[in-house]
Interface confidence: medium
C-alpha cells in the first residue's frame, strides 16, 4: 500500500532572467528513494537523480539547470518560456511511483518585483501569527502540568498507601504539520526499519523499476 | 526492435590491449545497462563487467578489476570494453548485451536482451 | 561469489518428449520483493545466446510456451514439455541476485 504523499512548492512564480529552486519531497512513508526524475510541461525529462549513481541533467538542460538542493532542481537565468508545469517522480521501493506536480510562472522583471512586495509582508504576518500560536500552545501546555501536578499532590498519599504497580499512560499524538512541539527524533538509517539480507539494497549500483509487464516493481543487482 | 553489432574480429600480441565496440540500434541506449561476457573456446560463459551510460558508471567483476574499462559514448550510441594487459587464456569469443530499461524508471542487467553478435579476440604470439 | 551449478551436462533427447534441466545456486535468488533473480539462456550452435526465461519463470517475447521455469530460493529448473529440433544447444542459467553475476556450466542437448 502506497502511504507516502509528496509535498511540492505547488504554485511558484519567478522574475525572467532570474532562478528558482522546484522541490519535492516524500513523507509518510518507509520507503526507499531510488530515483527521482524530473520532467518539463512537454515531459522531456530535465534530469535524474539516482541514489548510487548520483545525478544526471540531460544534455539541452545543461547550461541552464543545476542540481540540488537534495533532490530539487535548480532553473537559472528563466526565459518566459519556462512558464509551466514541472513534475518530480519518485521511484520508490516497495511503494513504487509517486508523482509530484509544480506550476511556475516565469513574470517580467517590474511584476515580479511588485509580487515580491505583496509577498514579504505576507510571509511576515504568517511568521508573527505562527508565533503567537506557539506561544499560547506553551502556555496551555504550561497551564495543564501545573493543574495535573497539583491534582496529582492532593491524591498521592492515597496513592502511596494503594499502590498497583500500574502506570497511567499518556496516549501521545503525532504533532501536526507546523506546531511547535518538539520531539527528540532519530535518524532513520539508510534502509529505514530494515534490517539483514535485503538492508545494503539501497547501495546497489544497478536496478529496473518496471511497469509494464510487473507491475511497479524495483529489482536489484547487490553488490556484494 | 533493439540490436546490437560488434566490431570485427582481432588478433593481438600478449601484453597489448584490444578495444571492442558494440553499437546500439533501436531502444533507449542511455538508460540501458550495457553488459559484456565472454567465452573462451569450448568453455561457458562468464560476466566481465556492465556500464549504464546515463550515469556512465561501470562495474567489473574482480577478476578484470584494474584490466578492463568498459565506456559508452552516448553520441554514437556505442560501448567500448577495452582488455589490457592480453594474455593467451584472453583469447575468446566477446559478447555484450544489453539490460532491461525503462526510459521514465530505471535500469538494470538483472536479464541480457538482445546480445551482439561477438567479437573474436584472439591472443598469440 | 554465488556458485551456480547446473545439471545434467548433456541431455540427450527424443523430438517429441520432455526434457528438464537444473540449476542450483550457493545463495538464494528470492529477493524481498518475491522476483528469484535467476534467467534461462540458450546458445544454438555457432550463435550468441539468446534470453528464454528472466526473473525465474517469466517467458522472453518470442519464446515459445514449449518453454517454462520454475522453482524458488536455490533450486530452480528449465522445462521443455516437448523437445523439438530447433531446441538444441547448449543451455546456461544466470543468477543477476548479487554481484557478480555468475552462469551456470550450461548443459548440452542435443537430439538421440
Known amino acids: 500500500m502506497m502511504t507516502g504523499t509528496i509535498e511540492t512548492t505547488g504554485n511558484i512564480s519567478a522574475k525572467k532572467g532570474g532562478s528558482v529552486i522546484l522541490q519535492c519531497h516524500l513523507s509518510s512513508t518507509m520507503a526507499q528513494v531510488t530515483q527521482v526524475n524530473w520532467e518539463q510541461h512537454d515531459h522531456s525529462l530535465l534530469a535524474i537523480r539516482n541514489a548510487e549513481l548520483g545525478w544526471h541533467i540531460y544534455p539541452a538542460f545543461k547550461d541552464r539547470v543545476a542540481p540540488g538542493p537534495g533532490l530539487g532542481l535548480t532553473l537559472q537565468s528563466l526565459t518566459m518560456n519556462d512558464t509551466g508545469e514541472y513534475f518530480c517522480t519518485y521511484h520508490t521501493y516497495p511503494d513504487g511511483t509517486y508523482r509530484g506536480r509544480i506550476f511556475l510562472e516565469v513574470l517580467e522583471s517590474s511584476v515580479a518585483e511588485h509580487s515580491a512586495r505583496f509577498q514579504i509582508p505576507l510571509l511576515g504576518a504568517m511568521a508573527m501569527m505562527l508565533v503567537v500560536i506557539c506561544i499560547a500552545v506553551i502556555v496551555v501546555v504550561v497551564l495543564a502540568r501545573k493543574k495535573k501536578s497539583l491534582r496529582i499532590h492532593s491524591v498521592e498519599s492515597g496513592l502511596q498507601r494503594k499502590s498497583t504497580g500500574q502506570e497511567e499512560q499518556i496516549p501521545s499524538a503525532p504533532s501536526p504539520p507546523g506546531s511547535c512541539v518538539q520531539a527528540e527524533a532519530a535518524p532513520a538509517g539508510l534502509c529505514g526499519e530494515q534490517q539483514g539480507d535485503d538492508c545494503a539494497e539501497l547501495h546497489d549500483y544497478f536496478n529496473v523499476l518496471s511497469y509494464r509487464s510487473l507491475g511497479s516493481c524495483s529489482f536489484f543487482t547487490e553488490t556484494g | 526492435q533493439v540490436q546490437l553489432v560488434q566490431s570485427g574480429a582481432e588478433v593481438k600480441k600478449p601484453g597489448s590491449s584490444v578495444k571492442v565496440s558494440c553499437k546500439a540500434s533501436?531502444?533507449?541506449?542511455?538508460?540501458?545497462?550495457i553488459s559484456w561476457v565472454r567465452q573462451a573456446p569450448g568453455q561457458g560463459l562468464e560476466w566481465m563487467g556492465s556500464?549504464?551510460?546515463?550515469?556512465?558508471?561501470?562495474n567489473y567483476a574482480q577478476k578484470f578489476q584494474g584490466r578492463v574499462t568498459i565506456t559508452a559514448d552516448e553520441s554514437t550510441s556505442t560501448a567500448y570494453m577495452e582488455l589490457s594487459s592480453l594474455r593467451s587464456e584472453d583469447t575468446a569469443v566477446y559478447y555484450c548485451?544489453?539490460?532491461?530499461?525503462?526510459?521514465?524508471?530505471?535500469?538494470?542487467?538483472?536479464?541480457?536482451?538482445?546480445w551482439g553478435q561477438g567479437t573474436l579476440v584472439t591472443v598469440s604470439s | 561469489d554465488i556458485v551456480m551449478t547446473q545439471s545434467p551436462l548433456s541431455l540427450p533427447v527424443t523430438p517429441g518428449e520432455p526434457a528438464s534441466i537444473s540449476c542450483r545456486s550457493s545463495?538464494?535468488?528470492?529477493?524481498?520483493?518475491?522476483?528469484?533473480?535467476l534467467d534461462w539462456y540458450l546458445q544454438k550452435p555457432g550463435q550468441s545466446p539468446q534470453l528464454l526465461i528472466y526473473l525465474g519463470s517469466n517467458r522472453a517475447s518470442g519464446v515459445p510456451d514449449r518453454f517454462s521455469g520454475s522453482g524458488s530460493g536455490t533450486d530452480f529448473t528449465l522445462k521443455i514439455s516437448r523437445v523439438e529440433a530447433e531446441d538444441v544447444g547448449v543451455y546456461y542459467c544466470?543468477?543477476?541476485?548479487?554481484?557478480?553475476?555468475?552462469f551456470g556450466g550450461g548443459t548440452k542437448v542435443e537430439i538421440k
Open positions: 545463495q538464494s535468488l528470492l529477493h524481498s520483493n518475491g522476483y528469484n533473480y
Open positions: 544466470m543468477q543477476a541476485r548479487r554481484i557478480p553475476i555468475t
Open positions: 556500464i549504464i551510460p546515463l550515469f556512465g558508471k561501470a
Open positions: 548485451a544489453r539490460g532491461p530499461s525503462e526510459v521514465k524508471g530505471i535500469l538494470g542487467y538483472v536479464w541480457f536482451d538482445p
Open positions: 533501436g531502444g533507449t541506449f542511455l538508460s540501458s545497462a
